[in-house]
């Protein structure tokens, strides 16, 4: 899994007038890391591990750089021609990655009112845009502005690739990023569904990184995809993640089912409780 830095800048307009504030959220290796507004950036440590790593670092440099980026994005929003009444948003998402083989990727994406209308590969400088006419109109509008205004916006849009990677490398070097593995807690619960049927749910929580396999098996054999329902893998607010998978089974058949979990090279299987007993032994490898 590559190391990554992701900036999400948002500016707003109201009745055609660009608002003075901006909001930037920065994710480091998929974790909420910084949250910045016009005044300052604040570290957003999630749980004790982040506080330990981030310490009392001040974020003056990030505040300065991201304030500049916010101004640039506000200028871009001001040049979008189809400003209508009411509230509108322009979002710029920038992502850079450093892979295990030291290769890099970086890209930039623009969203207007939450809809993607323009992307750029920051390494090849190649632009792409969706097919819809609205997206294409917006894209042409913004691209033209960025070309015309390249001097005024400093070299922000051209140096972003290098800047993002430089910042990511700086964070990695300073030890902000911990390559850590936190195994999930897995528990299986049952609830009555309809007469003779029960829904069994397997929940994994408190794990990091986010990649996980969670699935139901009957008689040891994986159930087909369409007989299972999966929840999204979501942050749980502690710098870790949670998810679930559920399936419906006949009451009395519990002993034939196990939940299979795979995370960061570790595996475990978890049986279904019969009746009301919930504490069950699991097999960890």
């Amino acid at each position: 899994e590559p190391h990554s830095l992701r900036y999400n800048l948002t500016v707003l307009s109201w009745d055609g007038s660009v608002q003075s504030g901006f909001l930037t959220e920065v994710h480091l290796d998929g974790q909420p890391f910084l949250r910045c507004d016009r005044q300052k950036c604040r570290a957003k440590p999630q749980g004790q591990w982040a506080e330990d790593v981030l310490g009392n670092k001040t974020w003056d440099r990030e505040t300065r750089d991201l304030t500049g980026n916010g101004k640039d994005l506000r200028m871009t929003l001001a040049h979008i021609k189809d400003q209508k009444e009411g509230l509108h948003s322009l979002q710029e998402i920038r992502v850079c990655e450093i892979h295990e083989d030291n290769s890099t990727r970086s890209s930039q994406h623009f969203y207007y009112d939450g809809e993607l209308f323009l992307s750029q590969n920051l390494e090849t400088k190649e632009w792409t845009m969706p097919q819809s006419s609205r997206a294409q109109t917006l894209a042409m509008n913004v691209r033209n502005f960025l070309k015309e205004d390249a001097m005024k916006t400093k070299t922000h849009y051209h140096a972003m690739h290098a800047d993002c990677l430089q910042e990511l490398r700086r964070y990695l070097k300073s030890g902000v990023v911990l390559r850590r593995t936190v195994p999930p807690m897995v528990n299986v619960t049952r609830s009555e569904a309809s007469e003779g049927n029960i829904t069994v749910t397997c929940r994994a929580s408190g794990f990091y990184p986010w990649n996980i396999t969670l699935s139901w098996r009957q008689d040891g054999v994986s159930l087909s995809h369409d007989t299972q329902q999966w929840g999204d893998v979501l942050p749980d607010g502690n710098g870790t993640y949670q998810t679930w998978v559920a399936t419906r089974i006949c009451q009395g058949e519990e002993q034939r089912f196990t939940c299979y979990m795979e995370h960061s090279g570790n595996h475990s299987t978890h049986p279904v409780p019969s009746g009301k007993v919930l504490v069950l032994q699991s097999h960890w490898q």
């Epitope: 040891g220 009395g252 049986p271 069950l280």
Partner: antibody, heavy 118, light 107 residues
Framework: QIQLVQSGAEVKKPGASVKVSCKAF????????MNWVKQAPGQGLKWMGW????????TYADDFKGRVTFTLETSISTAYMELSRLRSDDTAVYFC???????????WGQGTLVTVSS | DIQMTQSPSSLSASVGDRVTITCSAS??????LNWYQQKPGKAPKLLIQ???LLHSGVPSRFSGSGSGTDYTLTISSLQPEDFATYFC?????????FGGGTKVEIK
């Protein structure tokens, strides 16, 4: 600590029946099924079937259907295997094994030797 | 029924040797395979489930691999307590069937 404790060795005459018990300790008996496995002297392992300890429903392997019966006494966390119309080739060690997810045998009893001899 | 054929049926090895036991299924079993170890006069013990997943408490010198119809149990450095008989078991289909066993003896 999880343990399965089986009844002692039996010597039977051909045509008789034998009933082997398997008492479970250290876990909730009705959360896991129970398998029965036969091992003839110097031979491999042969699965006889399993019983759902929650519903009491047995599943028998074809080779043993009609001669074997699995039963339960859940109040004392015990499973039973009864084999009838015994023949000399039924001489074997019979194991109970906890049925985890109906695909693996994660804890085994110590085995019960049944000798069929005239 | 799915037939499980183990080879060799017996082998002699010394402490520290690398030992490989194979198990071949009469049809594809999609990695649905377990391995057990049995010592004389004792019940079998689960070693590996689902082809390669070590059961809790099993030393890391044991490993499993394979796919389709052919599967392998490897002991990277044989220890005195590893002299025993090893069985594979498929759970792709009912009835559950075991291999004939491989006896690992002291050379």
């Amino acid at each position: 600590q999880i343990q399965l404790v089986q009844s002692g060795a039996e010597v039977k005459k051909p045509g008789a029946s034998v009933k082997v018990s398997c008492k479970a300790f250290g876990y909730t008996f009705t959360n896991y099924g129970m398998n029965w496995v036969k091992q003839a002297p110097g031979q491999g392992l042969k699965w006889m079937g399993w019983i759902n300890t929650y519903t009491g429903e047995p599943t028998y392997a074809d080779d043993f259907k009609g001669r074997v019966t699995f039963t339960l006494e859940t109040s004392i966390s015990t499973a039973y295997m009864e084999l009838s119309r015994l023949r000399s080739d039924d001489t074997a060690v019979y194991f109970c094994a906890r049925n985890y997810g109906n695909y693996l045998f994660d804890y085994w009893g110590q085995g019960t030797l049944v000798t069929v001899s005239s | 029924d799915i037939q499980m054929t183990q080879s060799p049926s017996s082998l002699s090895a010394s402490v520290g040797d690398r030992v490989t036991i194979t198990c071949s299924a009469s049809q594809g079993i999609s990695n649905y395979l377990n391995w057990y170890q049995q010592k004389p006069g004792k019940a079998p013990k689960l070693l590996i489930q689902y082809t390669s997943l070590l059961h809790s408490g099993v030393p890391s010198r044991f490993s499993g691999s394979g796919s389709g119809t052919d599967y392998t149990l490897t002991i990277s450095s044989l220890q005195p307590e590893d002299f025993a008989t090893y069985f594979c078991q498929q759970y792709s289909k009912f009835p559950r069937t075991f291999g004939g066993g491989t006896k690992v003896e002291i050379k």
